[in-house]
């Protein structure tokens, strides 16, 4: 999906109002210095591409993020403010239901969410630069 035509201001507002709080809640008990940020992004569409990938694509050591509250809110935000995004999710939703797994917060998942926080902050910074 090409995130170029999204309403970035609206996405930022949703992130600051609610998604960020859920990400921070997920990370509670860990320090920001516990993990190194290894994933970056260069512009707003690129940031959203990386955020989508890290949030919804299961990895061998962290398969359960898509069911977290911050992930559900991220999906809702993208569906709302990115033209045509929702139709790309119809088949993806069915696949996700089939592979639902037991919810376990592993250290690898914490590391992945730490990366997500970094990507979101980068998204906000690139938005501020444009303004």
């Amino acid at each position: 999906y090409d995130f170029t035509n999204c309403d970035f201001q609206k996405i930022e507002a949703d992130y600051l109002r609610t998604i960020s709080k859920d990400l921070i809640t997920y990370m509670s008990g860990t320090k920001s210095t516990d993990f190194n940020n290894t994933v970056s992004c260069s512009n707003r569409p690129h940031c959203l591409t990386e955020i989508q990938s890290l949030t919804f694509n299961p990895t061998p050591r962290c398969a359960s993020l898509a069911k977290e509250m911050f992930a559900r809110k991220t999906k809702a935000t993208l569906a709302l403010w990115c033209p045509g995004y929702s139709e790309t999710q119809i088949n993806a939703t069915q696949a996700m239901k089939k592979r639902r797994k037991r919810k376990v917060t592993t250290n690898k998942c914490l590391e992945q969410v730490s990366q997500l926080l970094g990507l979101w902050r980068r998204f906000i910074r690139t938005l501020l630069k444009k303004q």
Partner: antibody, heavy 120, light 107 residues
Framework: QVQLVQSGAEVKKPGASVKVSCKAS????????MHWVRQAPGQGLEWMGT????????DYAQKFQGRVTMTADTSTSTAYMELRSLRSDDTAVYYC?????????????WGQGTLVTVSS | EIVLTQSPGTLSLSPGERATLSCRAS??????VHWYQQKPGQAPRLLIY???QSISGIPDRFSGSGSGTDFTLTISRLEPEDFAVYYC?????????FGQGTKVEIK
């Protein structure tokens, strides 16, 4: 089963406000946005706006900006639509309709409609 | 704002005939079009979503097709209960909009 039950018919004077409620049952309220659509007598469907409980955000059609407020009480699974500064051309049936925000993405269940009559 | 134009405005047909309803978008919207049926005094009812996806409980005589800017709702053999008004709607981008409707009436 999924049900959306709207409040009863209203008669209002021009310049007044109306608040229509829509009580949802049979599904997880925060998994869906609540959209509001109106239909003037003998006319087509007109999208007014939406409130998304999951994100606590709303979006309105340009035509209604500044005159409409959509909210929800998640504790009672009830959505509200308030329209202010009513005019005679606001006479219409007002519908609420749910739409999935993390799946389905379509208005698959509708309320029965609330007739709002604006007359002096 | 995406404008949807439905045609014809009214379709006069007999039971058993085939109905073809058209919906044209003012800009490409991929497959983000849904079709609703509305009978007098009733709320709209979803028939087809994302251009061609069928809904459980909706008779299979209803089908949808199209992508981009041109979409079609087909009723293969009209039953007496199919005479109603049909609306297309786009959810490609906000504000979501409806077509003006096509009335399918008995000839």
């Amino acid at each position: 089963q999924v049900q959306l039950v709207q409040s009863g018919a209203e008669v209002k004077k021009p310049g007044a406000s109306v608040k229509v409620s829509c009580k949802a049952s049979g599904y997880i309220f925060t998994d869906y946005a609540m959209h509001w659509v109106r239909q003037a007598p003998g006319q087509g469907l007109e999208w007014m706006g939406t409130f998304i409980p999951l994100l606590d955000t709303s979006d309105y059609a340009q035509k209604f900006q500044g005159r409409v407020t959509m909210t929800a009480d998640t504790s009672t699974s009830t959505a509200y639509m308030e329209l202010r500064s009513l005019r005679s051309d606001d006479t219409a049936v007002y519908y609420c309709a749910r739409m999935g925000v993390t799946h389905s993405y379509v208005m698959d269940a509708w309320g029965q409609g609330t007739l709002v009559t604006v007359s002096s | 704002e995406i404008v949807l134009t439905q045609s014809p405005g009214t379709l006069s047909l007999s039971p058993g005939e085939r109905a073809t309803l058209s919906c044209r978008a003012s800009q490409p919207i991929s497959i983000s079009v849904h079709w609703y049926q509305q009978k007098p005094g009733q709320a709209p009812r979803l028939l087809i979503y994302f251009a061609s996806q069928s809904i459980s409980g909706i008779p299979d005589r209803f089908s949808g097709s199209g992508s981009g800017t041109d979409f079609t709702l087909t009723i293969s053999r009209l039953e007496p209960e199919d005479f109603a008004v049909y609306y297309c709607q786009q959810t490609f981008s906000l504000p979501y909009t409806f077509g003006q409707g096509t009335k399918v009436e008995i000839k």
